[in-house]
Structure formats: C-alpha cells, structure tokens
Amino acid sequence: DGNTTRTPETNGSLCGAPGENCTGTTPRQKSKTHFSRCPKQYKHYCIHGRCRFVMDEQTPSCICEKGYFGARCEQVDLFY
C-alpha cells in the first residue's frame, strides 16, 4: 500500500507498540505511517472495508467503505 500520511483527525492517535489498536483521540502531530498488505490471518478482519497492516504497530486496521465505521467497519452510519 505504500506510505500514507495519517493525522489524528482522521485516524485517531498514533501508537507505537506492536499489538496496540489505535482508536484513541489524543492529538498528535502529523506523522508518516507505513502500511503493507494485511497478513492472511486477518482476511476476515474488516467486515465492510479493506484491511491494511500498520507496520509501526504490527496490527491490522481497516479502511471502511462509505456508510460504515468502527474498528472493523462493522457499524452502519445511519446519517450517510
């Protein structure tokens, strides 16, 4: 997937340790975040979205399809 600039406004706080889910909202400065394809074991992790692997954290994260949100894109956005 290459490199993406991720900001707290769109992706929550950036966390550093392997295994951590980054779902907080602590403001951080813009940071360059590296992604790769998700390991095969996370094939079904993102319910309504695309999986990518956050290299710094060594965890999967989801890019949700329009109309969905949540860590796994499991929730429907009723206002969409």
Epitope: P18, G19, E20, P39, K40, Q41, Y45, A71, R72
Partner: antibody, heavy 116, light 106 residues
Framework: QVQLLESGGGLVQPGGSLRLSCAAS????????ISWVRQAPGKGLEWVSY????????NYADSVKGRFTISRDNSKNTLYLQMNSLRAEDTAVYYC?????????WGQGTLVTVSS | DIQMTQSPSSLSASVGDRVTITCRAS??????LGWYQQKPGKAPKLLIY???SLQSGVPSRFSGSGSGTDFTLTISSLQPEDFATYYC????????FGQGTKVEIK
C-alpha cells in the same frame, strides 16, 4: 510497568475442563490484542488463540478449535481461556501474551497437567 | 499451515563469537517474522519483529534479516547472557513458531 499474571492452572483428568485467567496491569488493556501461547514440558512454543481489543475477532489453532474458548472482560482487565475436553497433549505451561501477531510482553505462565 | 524450520537445532559457541540462526518458512511470508529468546523457566522475550526491526530495549548486537521464505537472526558478539533458546515465529497465516535453536556454551 506492564504485567500479565496467569492463574487457574492445575491437574485435571482427560475429558475435563479448566478455566484460565490472565490479569493485566500497567497498560490500557482495552486497546490491545491478547493471545494465549503454550509450551509443553521440554518442547517448543505453540500459539493457541488470540482475541482483538474489542473481543469481536478471534482465531484458534487447529489443535484446540472447538474445545477452547477465548474471551476478555475489558472492565476487569482480564483475559480468559475456557478449556474443555482436555487431552494429555494439552499438558503445558500456558502463557498469556500481549499482541495478536507478535507478543511483546508475556506472563510467567500457569501449568496445566492433563492426566488420570 | 505454514511450517517454520530452524537450523541448527543447537549450537555451541564462545563469548565473543558471531552466531547465526536461520529460519525457513514452507511458503512466502513477506517479512511477517519475529524472533524470541527464552531462558530456562522464563517466558520468551521478543527480540526482532517484521524480520529486521529491533524491539525496544534489545541490544544492538541482535539483528535480523531476510524476506519471503529465508530469514536469519545474527548475534554479532555473543555475551554470557545470550546463552538461551531462540525461536522464530511467522504471523502471515495463523501464528506458528519454529522448533527452537539452543545456544550453549562451548
């Protein structure tokens, strides 16, 4: 500092059940994936199961699928492993470890012995 | 399932030696590989993740390399505290460990 403390191990007969617990402290438990990894006496490491931070995404090793159930209570900072239909080959030290893909902190382990 | 094969199973070395342990995956795992150190009666310790990234707090004499199916852990100058068993672990498909390599004192 990060601490993981397993409990609940012991001697159980084949076919029996046991529930392991792992109490976590020193980090925001609800933000991390957590796993169980086991090690039979004198043998290597075997990953058993993991659960994601919300408790909605779970995977198991084929060797325990259908017999073991992983769960977590984020309000209690505790991970669980319910082990049913235990076999002699389940005898091992069971570790809880922080992470789903990689394991950066481990508990000291709890010994489960399955024997008649 | 992806099988991880480590070699050698054991090795004898002296303090100051350069030690290399290899790990081969039965299919390509990109760089989804970690290395752990375990001492008798203790829990494993993560040394390397993503094949070559050094875990925080781990001495720089440890290094990892490789991608695809062939990976290497190198200890540039063996120290007394490094005598232990080392495991590789893949995390592309469901997590599996190698059988371990025991590093003993010569």
């Amino acid at each position: 500092q990060v601490q993981l403390l397993e409990s609940g191990g012991g001697l159980v007969q084949p076919g029996g059940s046991l529930r392991l617990s792992c109490a976590a402290s020193g980090f925001t438990f609800s933000r991390y994936w957590i796993s169980w990894v086991r090690q039979a006496p004198g043998k290597g490491l075997e990953w058993v199961s993991y659960i994601d931070s919300t408790g909605t995404f779970i995977n198991y090793a084929d060797s325990v699928k259908g017999r073991f159930t992983i769960s977590r209570d984020n309000s209690k900072n505790t991970l669980y492993l319910q082990m049913n239909s235990l076999r002699a080959e389940d005898t091992a030290v069971y570790y809880c470890a922080r992470g789903g893909s990689l394991f950066d902190y481990w508990g000291q382990g709890t010994l489960v012995t399955v024997s008649s | 399932d992806i099988q991880m094969t480590q070699s050698p199973s054991s090795l004898s070395a002296s303090v100051g030696d350069r030690v290399t342990i290899t790990c081969r995956a039965s299919q390509g795992i990109i760089s989804y590989l970690g290395w752990y150190q375990q001492k008798p009666g203790k829990a494993p310790k993560l040394l390397i993740y993503a094949a070559s990234s050094l875990q925080s707090g781990v001495p720089s004499r440890f290094s990892g390399s490789g991608s695809g199916t062939d990976f290497t852990l190198t200890i540039s100058s063996l120290q007394p505290e490094d005598f232990a068993t080392y495991y590789c672990q893949q995390y592309d498909a469901l997590n599996t460990f190698g059988q371990g390599t025991k590093v003993e004192i010569k």
